[in-house]
Interface confidence: medium
């Protein structure tokens, strides 16, 4: 069962999944100037059996410029910087992936993919939040959100996290000395 909504948004925070439940879909989105190859599926799907899961299909993008043009589309410095970030994230994500039954790990990257990955999560999926650079985390509870089914409708639980700038007041109302806990997740673009 697909989750109806996106996970909750938290100011100055991003979220990501450590592993993706079977049934999760990832759109094959391409960056500007590129489109999905004609024969390509519009998404990758996490599928599997009782013991192993993997992404079915593979995303590929091709230049959307006319075929007979000789002008090459070269990534602009900004695009190159964005791709570099994604590459570093991939390395970090792949380095410490654990194999969870019924889950796929972070999908492989693809050439000229869009800078933001759009996921369609399923019930039971957990996503983890961390504060963006320059902000620190104040936790009331777990910095995670789970897609749950209640009364036939899907909803995401509310993560107990506030991200505060170094100069801002660092306490929840009515609390004394909150402990800023270290963020254990690699930095990531927001997934949807």
């Amino acid at each position: 069962e697909l989750c109806d909504d996106d996970p909750p948004k938290i100011t100055h925070a991003t979220f990501k999944a450590v592993a993706y439940k079977e049934g999760t879909m990832l759109n094959c989105e391409c960056k500007r100037g590129f489109r999905r190859i004609k024969s390509g599926s519009p998404y990758m799907l996490c599928t599997g059996n009782s013991s192993h899961s993997s992404w079915d299909n593979q995303c590929q993008c091709t230049s959307s410029a006319a075929r007979n043009t000789t002008k090459q589309v070269t990534p602009q410095p900004e695009e190159q910087k964005e791709r570099k970030t994604t590459e570093m994230q991939s390395q970090m994500q792949l380095a410490d992936q654990v194999s969870l039954p019924g889950h796929c790990r972070e999908p492989p990257p693809w050439e000229n993919e869009a800078t933001e990955r759009i996921y369609h999560f399923v019930v039971g999926q957990t996503v983890y939040y961390q504060c963006v650079q320059g902000y620190r985390a104040l936790h009331r509870g777990p910095a995670e959100s789970v897609c749950k089914m209640t009364h036939g409708k899907t909803r995401w639980t509310q993560p107990q996290l506030i991200c505060t700038g170094e100069t801002e007041p660092s306490q929840f109302p009515g609390e004394e000395e909150p402990q800023a806990s270290p963020d254990g997740l690699p930095e990531s673009e927001t997934s949807r």
């Epitope: 599928t47 599997g48 059996n49 013991s51 192993h52 899961s53 993997s54 992404w55 079915d56 590929q60 091709t62 230049s63 090459q72 589309v73 070269t74 990534p75 791709r83 590459e87 991939s90 390395q91 792949l94 492989p108 990257p109 693809w110 050439e111 000229n112």
Partner: antibody
Framework: QVRLQQSGPELVKPGASVQMSCKAS????????INWVKQRPGQGLEWIAW????????YFNENFKDKATLSVDKFSSTAFMLLSSLTSEDSAVYFC???????????????WGTGTTVTVSS | QIVLSQSPAILSASPGEKVTMTCRAS?????IHWYQQKPGSSPKPWIY???NLASGVPGRFSGSGSGTSYSLTVSRVEAEDAATYYC???????FGGGTELELK
């Protein structure tokens, strides 16, 4: 030691089918993608398809969708490729190759099989 | 679909010479891999993600490039380097036509 051992040479008639195998050893077979690559005599390399042995997911080069069928036997750690409706164009050496995308997130063929020679002749 | 063109098709060199072969992509790509193949043998991984040498590859080999142009360089060619070298796009798995390095 990681190895991919492929089956022996095949001489087949036009229109027939042939199945070749690729036996993996030295690693967890179900954790890596197995790719198949074609090389015609004196020619370059052409990627055919991959299969993920853990669950049988496959992904094909469009040019081979109607030509090749991939399967695996997890118990013997063996991947198979069946080629059908053979013509002289299918005469080639076929390699299996293990792929990983752990090299900085990039797909990479890190171990190659010994190759199976297929000759199509009447 | 990305097309990779390798040049030259045949590269003749004397031992100790520096040689460079190129791989051009039909549109910009972020990385390519290189494989070495000797007659009658399977291809071997040689350079991955543009510039990283595979295990056991001598340090005289190097890879570089970006966008649509990539190259493999041998700083001082040795007899054992005689082989065909193929570039491959990391995502579509397309291979170039190969460059045969032969020794004079």
């Amino acid at each position: 030691q990681v190895r991919l051992q492929q089956s022996g040479p095949e001489l087949v008639k036009p229109g027939a089918s042939v199945q070749m195998s690729c036996k993996a050893s030295g690693y967890t077979f179900t954790d890596y993608y197995i790719n198949w690559v074609k090389q015609r005599p004196g020619q370059g390399l052409e990627w055919i398809a991959w299969i993920f042995p853990g669950n049988g997911n496959t992904y094909f080069n469009e040019n081979f969708k109607d030509k090749a069928t991939l399967s695996v036997d997890k118990f013997s750690s063996t991947a198979f490729m069946l080629l059908s409706s053979l013509t002289s164009e299918d005469s080639a050496v076929y390699f299996c190759a293990r792929a990983t995308y752990d090299h900085g997130g990039y797909w990479y063929f890190d171990v190659w099989g010994t190759g199976t020679t297929v000759t199509v002749s009447s | 679909q990305i097309v990779l063109s390798q040049s030259p098709a045949i590269l003749s060199a004397s031992p100790g010479e520096k040689v460079t072969m190129t791989c051009r992509a039909s549109s910009s790509v972020s990385h390519i891999h290189w494989y070495q193949q000797k007659p009658g043998s399977s291809p071997k991984p040689w350079i991955y993600a543009t510039s990283n040498l595979a295990s056991g590859v001598p340090g005289r080999f190097s890879g570089s490039g970006s966008g649509t142009s990539y190259s493999l360089t041998v700083s001082r060619v040795e007899a054992e380097d005689a082989a065909t070298y193929y570039c491959q796009h990391w995502n579509s798995f397309t291979f170039g036509g190969g460059t045969e390095l032969e020794l004079k």
